[in-house]
């Protein structure tokens, strides 16, 4: 499946919105820094393209889940959050449509279960961290910066997939 060019633009807009959402300086939150253990190896180049789509979808869906909680709504600017949701939703739709376009060809298993579980556990660690830090402004800033980093890495995978074609 060829992810549309708009998907790439959407990824860049998502990163831009995440940057705009910053409310406090990360430097004032150094004591709250945390290593969430992003499973970077699950986004490596060893996958077939069909197998990466569910992993990318998982990443975006989990970001959407994380930022659509009541606690998140209270932490961020509502206008930026709505724009952010729109971008994530469009990317999920693109990836979903990709699976449907695969009909008629030999359908590869969607399950790269280890990779998907690794992504889920990563987001569980983030959720647990936020709870432990009582959803403080610094905790949210640390998480925002982390999501920017991990989303950027997963976006790079998408780009490498496109360049492979």
């Amino acid at each position: 499946c060829d992810l549309p060019q708009t998907h790439s633009l959407g990824s860049r807009r998502t990163l831009m919105l995440l940057a705009q959402m910053r409310r406090i300086s990360l430097f004032s939150c150094l004591k709250d820094r945390h290593d969430f253990g992003f499973p970077q190896e699950e986004f490596g180049n060893q996958f077939q393209k069909a197998e990466t789509i569910p992993v990318l979808h998982e990443m975006i869906q989990q970001i959407f889940n994380l930022f659509s909680t009541k606690d998140s709504s209270a932490a961020w600017d509502e206008t930026l959050l709505d724009k952010f949701y729109t971008e994530l939703y469009q990317q999920l739709n693109d990836l979903e449509a990709c699976v449907i376009q695969g009909v008629g060809v030999t359908e590869t298993p969607l399950m790269k279960e280890d990779s998907i579980l690794a992504v889920r556990k990563y987001f569980q660690r983030i959720t647990l961290y936020l709870k432990e830090k009582k959803y403080s402004p610094c905790a949210w800033e640390v998480v925002r910066a982390e999501i920017m980093r991990s989303f950027s890495l997963s976006t790079n995978l998408q780009e490498s997939l496109r360049s492979k074609e």
Partner: antibody, heavy 126, light 110 residues
Framework: EVQLLESGAEVKRPGSSVRVSCRAS????????ISWVRQAPGQGLEWMGR????????NYAQNFRGRITITADKSPLTAYLELSSLRFEDTAVYYC???????????????????WGQGSLVTVSS | EIVLTQSPGTLSLSPGEGATLSCRAS???????LTWYQQKPGQSPRLLIY???SRATGVPDRFSGGGSGTDFTLTISRLEPEDFAVFYC???????????FGQGTKVEIK
Amino acid sequence: EVQLLESGAEVKRPGSSVRVSCRASGDTFSSYPISWVRQAPGQGLEWMGRILPALGVTNYAQNFRGRITITADKSPLTAYLELSSLRFEDTAVYYCASPSADIIPSILGTTLFAFWGQGSLVTVSS
Amino acid sequence: EIVLTQSPGTLSLSPGEGATLSCRASQNVSRHYLTWYQQKPGQSPRLLIYGGSSRATGVPDRFSGGGSGTDFTLTISRLEPEDFAVFYCQSYHSPPPVYTFGQGTKVEIK
């Protein structure tokens, strides 16, 4: 686990409108769509439409366009179905249904209905 | 728009027997996007099989799903008394999102 609780039974006149509500509790996310599915007496299931509460984005089945409106509140997470210009054949049990965040992989999550409300009977009668 | 046709309409079987239910699509459907539900009288539907062949939580392993393209099956290896119900297949297509149900197959006690 998600629990979906629908409003009570309604009796309506032909030509009028009905509004059914569905309140979600438990492990809910406004980032997953809530759908409405109906079942006429002794008949099969029919998808009517869905809403993504986080954005208010709606999608409606062709059969209902023009007389269906689905809305939602994010807190507490509640979806509403409004059906206008009611006809006798709209007599049915109306279910709200949602996916599960636990489905692996999540790309399948929004394609199915893991959780269902108890159903709300709407009777159209003169 | 995709049409799902289920057959047979009714299946009369005894407990302990096996059952094979068919769901035929009017056009190709990704097996990943084919789901089966069970509905007992007076109850809401219950998710049974998703992704064509994955069992939902708590579903016994006597239920299995298979097929691809336009032909899908739900197999119950040995019917238990609690299995008698109406079974629906459902497909998903996007964009825009459309959910389609088959008309149902009733599995009744012979």
